[in-house]
Structures are given as structure tokens and as C-alpha cells.
Interface confidence: low
């Protein structure tokens, strides 16, 4: 329904607190380098303006679109040209081109300092002194570092962040109470950001149809008792929500997400038996809970798929009448029967089915042509099953750190042109699939592992898109969303790569490695491992293992030495010489 004033409509729907938080997130995601105080000032100005529109929807400028209002406000930033360079050119454009221009300049890897966690007492004092500013700062810092973070979900994180400080700053042992909660929020936040980034990439790079297919498969697995029409309605609404959030329309997105949660809870009897607890929670918790809800039980009496999709004489007629609806029904029926498959596998099966119908429905004997289509699915199903089995065995044998190292070597050999920090970050995340998924029973391993790998490989794709250095990465990232993982799995050693010249500086370490946390120390060692492979791509696993074992022993020895720095200098030279000899450099 049309509203005289869109800004007044959203302010009234969301309330002042959520309105201000969402505008802050939106601005921080667009202007990622702007100081906190500047953003707060802009948000306050927008909020004051919104209030005048609530009072009188006919007031001047209240009829303008949110993009126009927000874009005009962002373009008042005095330092736009010097801070953002060509992004300032966006301000010369009219809507909707101006907003598209801002979206194109979102930076997945902004040049921002690492967030350092202050002492617990310092944080608690800041929280008590000015709770509102403290929480706004959290929203701002997360939003600018994660420009595609799902805004309504970030409000949920902020609520938990506030709850953690409220509880723990009164506790006897503040640190013991607070630090594990903050670690959990950080890890969950990174995962949430990466999952949303894949949704936005899916919409922006592969279009609405690709996202809808993903949503049909996932919601059908989650709500197998729901009718196809019900799932279709949910998919349409969910697509609107994510399109809005990925497009920077955060007020509309949050409002529509709340409406969708309300609809699901009002109709839970026809959707899922697992929603009851979620629907008793307040709004932010409710939406989060629904998004994470476990799969409902499959109906007991589901007939064979073959009847409607292979044996029926009306297959081509039904397909021709409404291709996407028929394929959607196929995907729905297949997915609700297979919670044990990954979403990307289900989408590969649907694509194979579509390709077969396109070919066979034009053939002389269509039925004869597509009769064996389900046989084509077998190798597609077995490939991820075998891959997961092999990798879980390797993970159980090596443990997480050494499993990550195996992946580091594997991926550096596949795409050695990719920057070392990106290879380390992505391979470490790929390696976490072991701890995350291998503990599950067979029936849950594939959806856990392959859909998680899709999220991690998307991180590689968006980081690589910013500075493309490898045609192979570009190819795997752009050709097919659902075949990204098989594409990367199929890559062999890049024979065209010219090894880097050996540089002893790369393997020079200092005493400060001894004071690093275990995680940071691992990253240093893994950085050296990647650089080693870039120097000697044909090195065998055994050679690399020997060098890395020597390196670990060297770090351990020098960290125990009285004169650490001298030890690192002298033993380091010996290690480099021994490594060169071992690798034939």
C-alpha cells in the first residue's frame, strides 16, 4: 500500500530505537571509513526529520523515497572525495543509479584496523557511563567491517551484546562471565556475516531465480509437511526481504522480515511442528529462531518421485505449461524427501533434470529419452559423499590445525596467484568444516559440510573479485553458483605458475612470535607454509611436513631460550639453509 511518507511509515512501524539503529547500520555499511561521530550526527539529523514527517506527512520532502533522503544525507559528507575517491562521483547521479553506485563501492575487505578488545573493566566502565553510545559503537564497528551483514540480525546480536554486559559487569568475576560470551558472539557474527554474503552474492551475481531455487530447496527440507503453495509464498516473501537487505533498503527489510515472522507464526500449523517455541519469543529472537529452526519430520507416506516426474505421460506438457513452477515442484518434492542432501546438490539435481527435459521434450520419443534421468543423479550424489568421507577421515587422523595445513597446501597449489592472507584465511575456514561437520552422523554430514563450504568459497570469490589475480578462481566463481565447490575440487596443480624467487626474508622470524596467542602463532606458521609452497609448488607432502616440523621445533626452541632474539637470528639462518637444501631451492 502506498504511503504519503515512506520515512514516516517506517519510523512508525519500527519504532525510534530500531529506526535509528538501522539507519546507523545502513550509513556505516555505505561509508565504511567515516568516523563514528559523523555517522551519529547524520543519523540524528535523519531521525529528527523522520519525526517531523510523522507529525505531518505532507511536510516538505517527506514524500521523497528513502534512497533519495539517505543518499542526499550521505552526499553532504564534506570529506567524501578525499576519503572515498571515485565513490564521490555517485553523488552526481540521480536515483536509482546513485544507490546502485553506492552499492558497487561496498568493500568486503575494508582498510580498517583490527578490532582490539579492551580490558574487561574498561569495557564495563564504558558500558555503564554511556550504554547507548557503547551499543551504537558496536553496531557501527560491525556494520562497517561487514557491509552486507543482515541488518535485522545485527539488531539481535546487539541485544545479546547488551545482555552480556548487563549481566557480567555485575558479576564477581567479570572476565570469566563476559569473555566467553563475547567470543561466542564474535564467532557467530563472522559466520552470520559470511552466510548473508553468500545470499547477497547469489542475488546480485546470479539473479533472483538462483536465490529462489536455493530458498525452495532449503525451506522444503526444513518444512517438509508444508504444501508447495505455502513454501512458494514463503520463498517469495523471503526473497523480497533479502533483496531489500542486500540492496541497502534496511528499513523495508527489517519491517518485511517482522511481517514474515508474524505470518509464519500465525500459520505454523500448516508450516511446521517445530515452530512453537520460536513463536513464543520476542520479535528479534523469534526471527532468529525461525531462521535456525531444525527440520520438521518428513511425512510418512510420501509417494515415489518417479510417478510424477518420470513415469507420467504429462511430464513434457506440465513442463511446457509453466517451466519454473514445474521445476520448483520437482525441487520441492526432492528436497523434502532429502534432508540428508546439501542444498547445492539438490540444485545440481534440479539443473540436470531441467537440462534433460529441455533436450527430451523436443525429441521424437520424449518418454524414452528421459526415462533414465534419475540414473544420471547417482554420480552427482556420490561425488560429495565420497569427498566428505575422505576429508573427514583425514581430519580425524590429523586434527584441525594439520588438516588446515593440508588444505593450505592443496589450495595454494591450485591457485598460487591468490594473496597469502586470503589463502590463509580461506583455508583455515575450509579446515573448520572438520570440527563443525565430521562429528555429525552420515545423514547430517553432507548438508552441514557442502553448504558450509559454499559459504567459505564465496568469501574467496568476493575477496578475489576485488583484486582478480587468477583466471581459474574467476572461472570457478562465475560459471555456476552451485558448482563452485566441485569446480575448485577439480582443480589440479597450476602448471603455468612461475614459482616465486626464494627470499630468506619471507622466513625470518622474531621473538615476538612467542607472545602471540596460539591462533596467531598458527597463522604465522601457516603464512610461512603458503609462501613455501609458492616458492616450491612441486614440493611433496613429505618435504613440506619435514620443513614445517623443523620450523615448529625452531619456534619452540627459541621461545624457551634466554636470549630469544639471538636464537631466532642464528637458528633461523640455519633453518632457512636446511629448508633450502631439503626442498632443493
Amino acid at each position: 500500500d502506498a504511503h504519503k511518507s515512506e520515512v514516516a511509515h517506517r519510523f512508525k512501524d519500527l519504532g525510534e530505537e530500531n529506526f535509528k539503529a538501522l539507519v546507523l547500520i545502513a550509513f556505516a555499511q555505505y561509508l565504511q571509513q567515516c568516523p563514528f561521530e559523523d555517522h551519529v550526527k547524520l543519523v540524528n539529523e535523519v531521525t529528527e526529520f523522520a519525526k517531523t514527517c510523522v507529525a505531518d506527512e505532507s511536510a516538505e520532502n517527506c514524500d521523497k523515497s528513502l534512497h533519495t533522503l539517505f543518499g542526499d544525507k550521505l552526499c553532504t559528507v564534506a570529506t567524501l572525495r578525499e576519503t572515498y575517491g571515485e565513490m564521490a562521483d555517485c553523488c552526481a547521479k540521480q536515483e536509482p543509479e546513485r544507490n546502485e553506485c553506492f552499492l558497487q563501492h561496498k568493500d568486503d575487505n575494508p582498510n580498517l584496523p583490527r578490532l582490539v578488545r579492551p580490558e574487561v573493566d574498561v569495557m564495563c566502565t564504558a558500558f555503564h557511563d554511556n550504554e547507548e553510545t557503547f551499543l551504537k559503537k558496536y553496531l557501527y564497528e560491525i556494520a562497517r567491517r561487514h557491509p552486507y551483514f543482515y541488518a535485522p540480525e545485527l539488531l539481535f546480536f546487539a541485544k545479546r551484546y547488551k545482555a552480556a554486559f548487563t549481566e557480567c559487569c555485575q558479576a564477581a568475576d567479570k572476565a570469566a562471565c563476559l569473555l566467553p560470551k563475547l567470543d561466542e558472539l564474535r564467532d557467530e557474527g563472522k559466520a552470520s556475516s559470511a552466510k548473508q554474503r553468500l545470499k547477497c552474492a547469489s542475488l546480485q551475481k546470479f539473479g533472483e531465480r538462483a536465490f529462489k531455487a536455493w530458498a525452495v530447496a532449503r525451506l522444503s527440507q526444513r518444512f517438509p509437511k508444508a504444501e508447495f503453495a505455502e513454501v512458494s509464498k514463503l520463498v517469495t516473501d523471503l526473497t523480497k526481504v533479502h533483496t531489500e537487505c542486500c540492496h541497502g533498503d534496511l528499513l523495508e527489510c527489517a519491517d518485511d522480515r517482522a511481517d514474515l515472522a508474524k505470518y509464519i507464526c500465525e500459520n505454523q500449523d500448516s508450516i511446521s511442528s517445530k515452530l512453537k517455541e520460536c513463536c513464543e519469543k520476542p520479535l528479534l529472537e523469534k526471527s532468529h529462531c525461525i531462521a535456525e529452526v531444525e527440520n520438521d519430520e518428513m511425512p510418512a507416506d510420501l509417494p515415489s518421485l518417479a510417478a510424477d516426474f518420470v513415469e507420467s505421460k504429462d511430464v513434457c506438457k506440465n513442463y511446457a505449461e509453466a517451466k519454473d513452477v514445474f521445476l520448483g515442484m520437482f525441487l520441492y518434492e526432492y528436497a523434502r524427501r532429502h534432508p540428508d542432501y546439501s542444498v547445492v546438490l539438490l540444485l545440481r539435481l534440479a539443473k540436470t533434470y531441467e537440462t534433460t527435459l529441455e533436450k527430451c521434450c523436443a525429441a521424437a520419443d520424449p518418454h524414452e529419452c528421459y526415462a533414465k534421468v534419475f540414473d544420471e543423479f547417482k554420480p552427482l550424489v556420490e561425488e560429495p559423499q565420497n569427498l566428505i568421507k575422505q576429508n573427514c577421515e583425514l581430519f580425524e587422523q590429523l586434527g584441525e590445525y594439520k588438516f588446515q595445513n593440508a588444505l593450505l597446501v592443496r589450495y595454494t597449489k591450485k591457485v598460487p596467484q591468490v594473496s597469502t592472507p586470503t589463502l590463509v584465511e580461506v583455508s583455515r575456514n575450509l579446515g573448520k568444516v572438520g570440527s563443525k561437520c565430521c562429528k555429525h552422523p552420515e545423514a547430517k554430514r553432507m548438508p552441514c559440510a557442502e553448504d558450509y563450504l559454499s559459504v567459505v568459497l564465496n568469501q574467496l570469490c568476493v575477496l578475489h573479485e576485488k583484486t582478480p589475480v587468477s583466471d581459474r578462481v574467476t572461472k570457478c566463481c562465475t560459471e555456476s553458483l552451485v558448482n563452485r565447490r566441485p569446480c575448485f575440487s577439480a582443480l589440479e596443480v597450476d602448471e603455468t605458475y612461475v614459482p616465486k624467487e626464494f627470499n630468506a626474508e619471507t622466513f625470518t622470524f622474531h621473538a615476538d612470535i612467542c607472545t602471540l596467542s596460539e591462533k596467531e602463532r598458527q597463522i604465522k606458521k601457516q603464512t610461512a607454509l603458503v609462501e613455501l609452497v609458492k616458492h616450491k609448488p612441486k614440493a611433496t607432502k613429505e618435504q613440506l611436513k619435514a620443513v614445517m616440523d623443523d620450523f615448529a621445533a625452531f619456534v619452540e626452541k627459541c621461545c624457551k631460550a634466554d636470549d630469544k632474539e639471538t636464537c631466532f637470528a642464528e637458528e633461523g639462518k640455519k633453518l632457512v639453509a636446511a629448508s633450502q637444501a631439503a626442498l632443493g631451492l
Partner: nanobody
Framework: EVQLLESGGGLVQPGGSLRLSCAAS????????IGWFRQAPGKEREGVSC????????NYADSVKGRFTISRDNSKNTVYLQMNSLKPEDTAVYYC????????????????WGQGTQVTVSS
Amino acid sequence: EVQLLESGGGLVQPGGSLRLSCAASGFTLDYYAIGWFRQAPGKEREGVSCIASSGGSTNYADSVKGRFTISRDNSKNTVYLQMNSLKPEDTAVYYCAAAVLECRTVVRGYDYWGQGTQVTVSS
């Protein structure tokens, strides 16, 4: 994740000197090679000098050899570019950039960049 801030630029007469600083915040310079680049109006960004993470290895563009000296002070998390005998053709915006452990041969090999500082050599 990384912030680099250049300072020390300004207007100087031909034959004069300037010392540029590149300060890092939010990370430790120890494990990064730092390169200095410059870009004159209408020209490509070009490498000027680079120092590897340990400070043991440095390199310079032919046009600045013998006039410019790069150094690092890891305790201050800062890299310096001492520029002597400046010429009008040294006029440009000077940028520092960081790459893991070693110097790179191409501009795109650097992972992190500063915002730049203007150096103008004119009488």
C-alpha cells in the same frame, strides 16, 4: 584490517630534503614488507622503494637510487623514506603499502594501502 598513515609530505625547493613516515595501526609491521609508491597527475602509480619485513633487504627505483633511503623502526611500527636532492620530477602523491613478509614486483601484489601524502618540489 590494517591502517597505514603517511605523513611528512609538503612543499620543498629543488635540492631540498623531506622525510616521509608510514605508521601502521591495528597490526604489527614486523611481518610486513612496506613499499613506497608515487603517482604524479595523469601518470601510473610507480614503485619508489621497498623494505622487506626484517629490514635486511631493500630496493629502489633507478630514478631515486642514491638520493632516497628507506628504513624501518619496528618498535615504533613505522617505516621511513628519507628523500634528499629532490627534483621537480619527484612531485607526486606518495603512498605506502604493505605486503606479507616480502617486497612484491607488482602494485597489485600489495594487500594494504595508505591514503597518500602530497610532495611538491618547486622553486
